[in-house]
């Protein structure tokens, strides 16, 4: 139902990485505009992206208030230039999104190797602790602050001269691994939340190799 010149939004999809969260939908509007509302299961609806011709709405500011809550959004369709007009039932057309729980579902962004340092036959590899848009006491929290020990990093490391990748894991942002003296190694890291069933892993970090500028070598 609804007025003849509006269509309901469809394919509502959450796109979220490191809690930066955007709701996307279709279709591209023709003679209509959209408004988005978001709410927790028990909360009130809050309107965002008023009368927009976009087919996406950044809801980060709302979901970061409590990333462990489950959110629902809905997209209202209005005739362009006549936003007071409603559907035949007296309400504007709208479509509900799937439920979204940021803590369980946000994609893990690609990690970055911040540095590595060799001391004798040990190498310390440090992963950058990425800042998120989640705030506590007016400061932005890092990924580690938000996930704590739920977040694991897997390090893949290999001799530059071979293909086999050894692995190491940490629930901090640092690895200390044994290496063969006189060999150059390459490194890549992956963020993992093992307790999840979906979106468990990030993409791999860019590969960093010894003998390049990120590293430091100290002979003991």
């Amino acid at each position: 139902s609804g007025t003849t010149n509006t269509v309901a939004a469809y394919n509502l999809t959450w796109k979220s990485t490191n809690f930066k969260t955007i709701l996307e939908w279709e279709p591209k509007p023709v003679n209509q505009v959209y408004t988005v509302q978001i709410s927790t299961k028990s909360g009130d609806w809050k309107s965002k992206c008023f009368y927009t011709t976009d087919t996406e709405c950044d809801l980060t500011d709302e979901i970061v208030k409590d990333v462990k809550q489950t959110y629902l959004a809905r997209v209202f369709s209005y005739p362009a230039g006549n936003v007071e007009s409603t559907g035949s039932a007296g309400e504007p057309l709208y479509e509900n999104s799937p439920e979204f729980t940021p803590y369980l579902e946000t994609n893990l962004g690609q990690p970055t190797i911040q540095s590595f340092e060799q001391v004798g036959t040990k190498v310390n590899v440090t992963v950058e602790d990425e800042r998120t848009l989640v705030r506590r006491n007016n400061t932005f929290l890092s990924l580690r602050d938000v996930f704590g020990k739920d977040l694991i990093y897997t390090l893949y490391y290999w001799k530059s001269s071979s293909s086999g990748k050894k692995t190491a894991k940490t629930n901090t942002n640092e690895f200390l691994i044994d290496v063969d003296k006189g060999e150059n190694y390459c490194f890549s890291v992956q963020a993992v939340i093992p307790s999840r069933t979906v979106n468990r892993k990030s993409t791999d970090s860019p590969v960093e190799c010894m003998g390049q500028e990120k590293g430091e070598f100290r002979e003991i």
Epitope: I152, T154, Y156, S163, G164, K165, K166, T167, A168, K169, T170, N171, D178, S188, Q190, V192, P194, T197, V198, R200, K201, T203, D204
Partner: antibody, heavy 120, light 107 residues
Framework: EVQLVESGGGLVQPGGSLRLSCAAS????????IHWVRQAPGKGPEWVGY????????YYADSVKGRFTISADTSKNTAYLQMNSLRAEDTAVYYC?????????????WGQGTLVTVSS | DIQMTQSPSSLSASVGDRVTITCRAS??????VAWYQQKPGKAPKLLIY???FLYSGVPSRFSGSRSGTDFTLTISSLQPEDFATYYC?????????FGQGTKVEIK
Amino acid sequence: EVQLVESGGGLVQPGGSLRLSCAASGFTISSYIIHWVRQAPGKGPEWVGYIDPSNGYTYYADSVKGRFTISADTSKNTAYLQMNSLRAEDTAVYYCARDPQTLTSPFDYWGQGTLVTVSS
Amino acid sequence: DIQMTQSPSSLSASVGDRVTITCRASQDVNTAVAWYQQKPGKAPKLLIYSASFLYSGVPSRFSGSRSGTDFTLTISSLQPEDFATYYCQQHYTTPPTFGQGTKVEIK
């Protein structure tokens, strides 16, 4: 329900080849690491190698390096073990196992195994 | 590679007995040790992970502990279904390695 099912085992002559499959259901292999483990008759388990299907990274035991290759087809949710230049000492039951990539990564699910016999 | 030395290789016990199996790692493996139970013709089954954590669905008579590089699997009161072979495994470094196994037989 999480399940791993191996297939492709059988009798092969020394120097021959065989490809084992590990079909996964109840989870997506690209979200985990898949290991191959073998067990010779009357012996303990021996780790063969792993693959991370999300990036194709692999590592092999010295005893099989250069002869065995692990691969994965994420569209089929299946991992493979290609075994070439087989020797009598490769005779074993071959298992695939799932690694949840936790901090200490035990193998939480195993297949039922498939027997490979290398004999002339 | 890290060696996992398991002892004893076999033991005989009666239902209700307390059974202890040990594994010694050749170098530090932190708590990255698991214990598996295997019955003839079957795949190993995870019992204990991270040295002392009971895997889901495993009876509470099974427990694990760590002291440095020594790891212990204890069955507090042996049940008929516990007669099997037990293996330890480290996954601290690549390659993961297994102990040689302990066969628990009926006395």
